[in-house]
């Protein structure tokens, strides 16, 4: 079969890095700069992805492989293949319509990317907030005031928790 | 074949004033949302200002009520009037055509000029 498909199809023998020539008489030509073919039997070579602005080389183009781009320091990739870069914020922050802001109080994001989430609500669980959230860290929940109570298996006291919005003295 | 060039960069003293132009050809520029961006020696890329179509604009924290991005679509033209200026605005500053129209982010098929040096100091 492979020979009957050369015989009706002289591109099929051109391989990768290469493209079939109608010009020049159905010849494998090499793909031109900044160009490339990742199978045999092309009739033309693809351009070239180019890295800029933002994004920045992290695989140079070949004749057999498009170029692959990340982000500068500052962005992460998003989409597929890093088809846009999203600047970071701080920990504590979001990126809304204005750039980086603060995570509201109540609310806290623990990365440099994404969303403030709102902090665990411990008393859904029946719990108590050992550790205060802040725009950084969510809450830490801790036994129920049940567990705490006279004769309840002894329980190391934690430290005290600061308040959000106090520094120490 | 898509061109952004900027001009307008030089030195000037803290407190003084520039005004960054961005040359635009090759695409339809009225209809598309365009950006200014920066990048301080030796940090990472910074997004400034962008403006929509529509001509509702967005800054960044630091340079809001100092800097004012505007567009003139007959002359395809972008702008950058930069007051007040700081050591700390010192940078290549970058004419991006912003495809995103998300403050912060941007795609791979956005158009960047070859950015133009504003060097803040006395």
């Known amino acids: 079969f492979e020979r009957t498909r050369s015989l009706q199809d002289p591109c099929s023998n051109c391989p990768a890095g290469t493209f079939c020539d109608n010009n020049r008489n159905q010849i494998c030509s090499p793909c031109p700069p900044n160009s490339f073919s990742s199978a045999g039997g092309q009739r033309t070579c693809d351009i070239c992805r180019q890295c800029k602005g933002v994004f920045r080389t992290r695989k140079e183009c070949s004749s057999t492989s498009n170029a692959e781009c990340d982000c500068t320091p500052g962005f992460h990739c998003l989409g597929a293949g890093c088809s846009m870069c999203e600047q970071d914020c701080k920990q504590g922050q979001e990126l809304t319509k204005k750039g980086c802001k603060d995570c509201c109080f109540g609310t806290f994001n623990d990365q440099k990317r994404g969303i403030c989430r709102p902090w665990t609500n411990c008393s859904l669980d029946g719990k108590s907030v050992l550790v205060n959230g802040t725009k950084e860290r969510d809450v830490v929940c801790g036994p129920s005031p049940a567990d705490l109570s006279p004769g309840a298996s002894s329980v190391t006291p934690p430290a005290p928790a600061r308040e959000p919005g106090h520094s120490p003295q | 074949e898509v061109q952004l060039v900027e001009s307008g960069g030089g030195l000037v003293q803290p407190g003084g004033s520039l005004r960054l132009s961005c040359a635009a050809s090759?695409?339809?520029?009225?209809?598309?949302?365009m950006s200014w961006a920066r990048q301080a020696p030796g940090k990472g890329f910074e997004w400034v200002a962008s403006i929509y179509s529509s001509g509702k604009t967005y800054y960044v924290e630091s340079v809001k009520g100092r800097f004012t991005i505007s567009r003139d679509n007959a002359k395809n033209s972008l702008y950058l009037q930069m007051n007040s200026l700081r050591a700390e605005d010192t940078a290549v500053y970058y004419c991006?055509?912003?495809?995103?129209?998300?403050?912060?982010?941007?795609?791979?098929?956005?158009?960047w000029g070859q950015g133009t040096l504003v060097t803040v100091s006395s």
């Open positions: 090759g695409f339809t520029f009225s209809s598309s949302a």
């Open positions: 991006a055509r912003w495809k995103t129209l998300r403050v912060g982010v941007w795609d791979e098929s956005d158009y």
